[in-house]
Interface confidence: low
């Protein structure tokens, strides 16, 4: 791991973060019925899942642990400059490296700082540069980077040959692994002909390891099991039902646009976040149950949002897969009840990606400055930026670009509790609609 | 001693192609960014393109990017500028330059721009119909 | 992009003057500027990078300074080979972008 600046921040993690408010119930749209011991095993199972991944995502992000930003000019401490820094020709003052465009990872006597790498055509940037920490780059899914030719990603073979059965997916950094069925060996060669091909479908989730899969998969079955007869036996029950079942067997109509004031505000996040107490001691995103991916290949088989829903609903299985549209609850100017959501917006962002997401988001360094300069005090910095943001692009400043730009900085779990308090704060509500829609 | 050398300039009609060559000695070519520089008549200076010292890297001004094309040849020593669809403001005299930060092999660092410290006598390009 | 505004444009000086040029940038470029003269029908010499670093074999007389958005190119006392264009360049970010030149005449 890198070495931090003396006066680095800790990692993101322990951030404040907004306690359960008013959300409106979502419920699935009309399916079959379900049993109701199935039911509750299911969303556990979904809740389990959703903790695993937020726990996952919260480790992924852990290295923010980037330097505290410090002033254009220092003084070198020993003939040395801090991280993110690089010392001036005169050997006298330390000058801060460029975001996103070089960096230093430690106490240097450099007269410059080391250009960040940028990540090829066929890769993802996992993480961006800062001033220090250079880029991090990955291949794109369906490609590899093998050991002996790490200069280019390589497509992963689509299916196993004739007679051999797979064994391990195609990840970032192997192709998929084949093995005859009877002898069990490895096979190495080029895959033959399409037609002779056992294809592999290309939405399965990278695993490394098949049967470390199976063993949690199975554990986390055993542990389903029991806290499902806990919370059975728990004075809980009554309380989850009736929102289990809404959840799992809605009554018909849009769930979308449930009439929230029949509602008692937060009943159902407190019923939520018992359960959630009870599943898994350590934060959780209060998102529905749908299942964020993690960043980074786990070996646990988890469920994809779209394969948590068909596991809910069967007759509706050959559906494409949906985006979920965030829509202002009361029909309401998007960018301006996006505007009054800003104010909360600094605990739900590690300090450390504020500055990267209002350039993802189209801010220049001196607007980045200036507002950094005329907000009221720390806290309140975030707000300026994203106030000169829709100034800036006015009706193109959507909650979907911030969101994007979230996931695009690698910050899940910020966008997950971003998304969730626009939910909550009964300001935005989920509107469905087709992945491709272009709505603000 | 060290020199650039451009040449390919000439007169092209709105709309074709022209390639620009750089030629550069008297240092280790391979471990400096490149870069091309223009200047229209009467005008001030234009940064154009800069292409890194293993061609791993290329970026481009507004005004010419999708249209031009910066690239390196270590093993030839030469830079190049490969310019299509012209237009009547490309017409210029068109500089190659050296970037004054220099790639070492024996640590990872490469620098960024700290200015152009060896320039060519410049080839001249003249757009017109 | 980041403009960069020269000024003035041009400017009549005698033997032995103190000349200042400036350069401002559109937003903060920190200390990532660089100053350059061009005398007619050559090309153009790097002077100072980085604000304030001398090139190898540029006179004494010639000095930098600045930060930010607001820098000063400053000729302590102007000499007859001093005559010529100058040039401030931004490298704090692509597309490397120059000021519009100013153009040190004899008065």
């Known amino acids: 791991m890198e070495q931090r600046g003396q006066n680095a921040p800790a990692a993101s993690g322990a951030r404040k973060r907004h306690g359960p408010g008013p959300r409106e119930a979502r419920g699935a749209r009309p399916g079959p019925r379900v049993p109701k011991t199935l039911v509750l095993v299911v969303a556990a199972v979904l809740l389990l899942v959703s903790a695993e991944s937020a726990l996952i995502t919260q480790q992924d992000l852990a290295p923010q642990q980037r330097a505290a930003p410090q002033q254009k000019r220092s003084s070198p401490s020993e003939g040395l400059c801090p991280p993110g820094h690089h010392i001036s020709e005169d050997g006298r003052d330390c000058i801060s490296c460029k975001y996103g465009q070089d960096y230093s990872t430690h106490w240097n006597d450099l007269l410059f700082c080391l250009r960040c790498t940028r990540c090829d055509s066929g890769e993802v940037e996992l993480s961006p540069c800062t001033t220090t920490r250079n880029t991090v780059c990955q291949c794109e899914e369906g490609t590899f980077r093998e050991e002996d030719s790490p200069e280019m990603c390589r497509k992963c073979r689509t299916g196993c040959p004739r007679g051999m059965v797979k064994v391990g997916d195609c990840t970032p950094w192997s192709d998929i692994e084949c093995v005859h069925k009877e002898s069990g060996t490895k096979h190495s060669g080029e895959v033959p002909a399409v037609e002779e091909t056992v294809t592999s479908s290309p939405g399965t989730p990278a695993s490394p390891c098949s049967l470390s899969g199976i063993i949690i998969g199975v554990t986390v079955a055993a542990v389903v099991l029991i806290v499902a007869v806990f919370v059975c036996k728990s004075l809980l029950w009554k309380k989850v039902l009736p929102y289990l079942k809404g959840i799992c067997s809605g009554g018909g109509g849009d769930p979308e646009r449930v009439d929230r004031s029949s509602q008692r505000p937060g009943a159902e996040d407190n019923v939520l976040n018992e359960i959630v107490s009870i599943l898994q001691p350590t934060q959780v995103p209060e998102q529905e149950m749908e299942v964020q991916e993690p960043a980074e290949p786990t070996g646990v088989n988890m469920l994809s949002p779209g394969e948590s829903e068909h596991l809910l609903e069967p007759a509706e299985a050959e559906r494409s897969q949906r985006r979920r549209l965030l829509v202002p609850a009361n029909e309401g100017d998007p960018t301006e009840t996006l505007r009054q959501c800003f104010d909360d917006f600094a605990d739900l962002v590690p300090f450390d990606s504020w500055e990267p997401l209002m350039r993802k988001l189209g801010l220049m360094d001196n607007e980045i400055k200036v507002a950094k300069a005329e907000a009221a005090g720390h806290r309140d910095t975030l707000y300026t930026m994203l106030i000169k943001w829709v100034n800036k692009t006015g009706r193109d400043a959507s909650v979907h670009t911030l969101l994007d730009a979230l996931e695009t900085l690698g910050e899940r779990l910020a966008k997950q509790k971003i998304e969730d308090h626009l939910l909550s704060s009964g300001k935005f509500m989920y509107l469905e609609g087709n992945a491709d829609s272009a709505m603000s | 001693q060290v020199q650039l050398v451009e040449s390919g300039g000439g007169v092209v009609q709105p709309g074709r192609s022209l390639r620009l060559s750089c030629a550069a000695s008297g240092f280790t070519f391979s471990t400096y960014g490149m870069h091309w520089v223009r200047q229209a008549p009467g005008k001030g200076l234009e940064w154009v393109a800069v292409i890194w010292y293993d061609g791993s890297n290329k970026y481009y001004a507004d005004s010419v990017k999708g249209r031009f094309t910066i690239s390196r040849d270590n093993s030839k020593n030469t830079l190049y500028l490969q310019m299509n669809s012209l237009r009547a403001e490309d017409t210029a005299v068109y500089y190659c330059?050296?970037?004054?930060?220099?790639?070492?092999?024996?640590?990872?660092?490469?620098?960024?721009?700290?200015?152009?410290?060896?320039w060519g006598q410049g080839t001249t390009v003249t757009v017109s119909s | 992009d980041i403009q960069m505004t020269q000024s003035p444009s041009s400017l009549s000086a005698s033997v032995g003057d103190r000349v200042t040029i400036t350069c401002r940038a559109s937003?903060?470029?920190?200390?990532?500027l660089n100053w350059y003269q061009q005398k007619p029908g050559k090309a153009p010499k790097l002077l100072i990078s980085a604000t304030s670093s001398f090139q190898s074999g540029v006179p004494s007389r010639f000095s930098g300074s600045g930060s930010g958005t607001d820098f000063t190119l400053t000729i302590s006392s102007l000499q007859p080979e001093d005559f010529a264009a100058y040039y401030c360049q931004q490298s704090y970010s692509t597309p490397l972008t120059f000021g519009g030149g100013t153009k040190v005449e004899i008065k």
């Open positions: 330059a050296r970037d004054r930060t220099v790639y070492s092999s024996s640590s990872p660092f490469y620098y960024y721009y700290y200015g152009m410290d060896v």
């Open positions: 937003q903060s470029i920190s200390s990532y």
